[in-house]
């Protein structure tokens, strides 16, 4: 039975050209996290954090994605096209797969809202394959 929940940074905003930290946290389960996959709104993979093998940043994002902090991901040099949904997929044993969602809004530099600002609505979501 899956007892865990994923807590994420929820809906966040950041300025164009700035950076933002995408963060998820799995709680309420003793399951072992074997891998965390970070995915973008168009279903492309940004990065994989394998518990033993470390980080793999996808080639298309190597210039502007940095691993961490922790199991999170730092997205740099933001463009307006980065606006949208991001997903963290936790592969765990023995529970299976949990998934969390973050919505990032990238704001024009002249507008309000700092990097990582804009009201952090903690969002709980879990999903099993």
């Amino acid at each position: 039975m899956m007892t865990g929940t994923i807590e994420t940074t929820g809906n966040i905003s950041a300025k164009k050209g700035g950076s933002v930290i995408l963060q998820c946290h799995l709680s309420s389960t003793m399951a072992q996290v074997t891998q965390v996959n970070w995915e973008q709104h168009d279903h492309s993979l940004l990065a994989i954090r394998n518990a033993e093998l470390g980080w793999h940043i996808y080639p298309a994002f190597k210039d502007r994605v940095a691993p961490g902090p922790g199991l999170g991901l730092t997205l740099q040099s933001l463009t307006m096209n980065d606006t949208g949904e991001y997903f963290c997929t936790y592969h765990t044993y023995p529970d299976g797969t949990y998934r969390g969602r973050i919505f990032l809004e990238v704001l024009e530099s002249s507008g309000g809202g700092g990097a990582g600002g804009g009201g952090h609505h903690h969002h709980h979501h879990h999903h099993h394959h």
């Epitope: 074997t34 891998q35 996959n37 995915e39 279903h43 492309s44 993979l45 994989i48 394998n50 033993e52 093998l53 470390g54 980080w55 793999h56 996808y58 080639p59 298309a60 592969h91 394959h129």
Partner: antibody, heavy 121, light 107 residues
Framework: QVQLQESGPGLVKPSGTLSLTCAVS?????????WHWVRQPPGKGLEWIGY???????NYNPSLKSRVTISVDKSKNQFSLKLSSVTAADTAVYYC??????????????WGQGTLVTVSS | DIQMTQSPSSLSASVGDRVTITCKAS??????VAWYQQKPGKAPKLLIY???YRYTGVPSRFSGSGSGTDFTFTISSLQPEDIATYYC?????????FGGGTKLEIK
């Protein structure tokens, strides 16, 4: 240039233990990467068996986990595979391979030439 | 486990032909797919990783595309030295799995 070379008995008796070694040259296996075993039954596809990470941790295919041990011999710069309680279904060409996870994800970029192991009495 | 189903299992083509091999994953694997070439009696060689990126030294006639569950491997102009069996592999999950292979022959 990294090179991998498998060695070990080509014939193993049913219920016995298959033991293979992969000698690595051109790179110290305790310096980085993960080191894998993959097998290919005659005329069939590839099956991942498991790996040993340079740190010493291991991970195995769940379907084989109860029978597999992969270990490292630092002094000889080699890693080994032991597969117990073998049957004819374990007859295959066994490959060792390297995975550069940081650059290529779960793709294996260097392979040994493979060694055929037949399980027969 | 995630199953990778390749098609066709074998195909025959002429030198200069455009050749396409497909691989279907049993669940969404995003772009965590690699392609290998294996010549008879030899070890597999990595050609493509992350679905569409050519490995170092791989000729430009080899390409990969796709995301989610459907992936394509293409040889734009078949050369005699391309005769081999080609395999896809997924690494989205922590248990890596390969397709059954596509054997490519010259007409």
């Amino acid at each position: 240039q990294v090179q991998l070379q498998e060695s070990g008995p080509g014939l193993v008796k049913p219920s016995g233990t298959l033991s293979l070694t992969c000698a690595v040259s051109g790179y110290s296996i305790t310096s980085g990467y993960s080191w894998h075993w993959v097998r290919q039954p005659p005329g069939k596809g590839l099956e991942w068996i498991g790996y040993v990470h340079y740190s010493g941790s291991t991970n195995y295919n769940p379907s084989l986990k109860s029978r597999v041990t992969i270990s490292v011999d630092k002094s000889k710069n080699q890693f080994s595979l032991k597969l117990s309680s073998v049957t004819a279904a374990d007859t295959a060409v066994y490959y060792c391979a390297r995975m550069d996870y940081g650059n290529y994800g779960g793709a294996m970029d260097y392979w040994g030439q493979g060694t055929l192991v037949t399980v027969s009495s | 486990d995630i199953q990778m189903t390749q098609s066709p299992s074998s195909l025959s083509a002429s030198v200069g032909d455009r050749v396409t091999i497909t691989c279907k994953a049993s669940q969404d694997v995003r772009t965590a797919v690699a392609w290998y070439q294996q010549k008879p009696g030899k070890a597999p060689k990595l050609l493509i990783y992350s679905a569409s990126y050519r490995y170092t030294g791989v000729p430009s006639r080899f390409s990969g595309s796709g995301s989610g569950t459907d992936f394509t491997f293409t040889i734009s102009s078949l050369q005699p030295e391309d005769i081999a069996t080609y395999y896809c592999q997924q690494y989205y999950s922590t248990q890596w799995t390969f397709g059954g292979g596509t054997k490519l022959e010259i007409k």
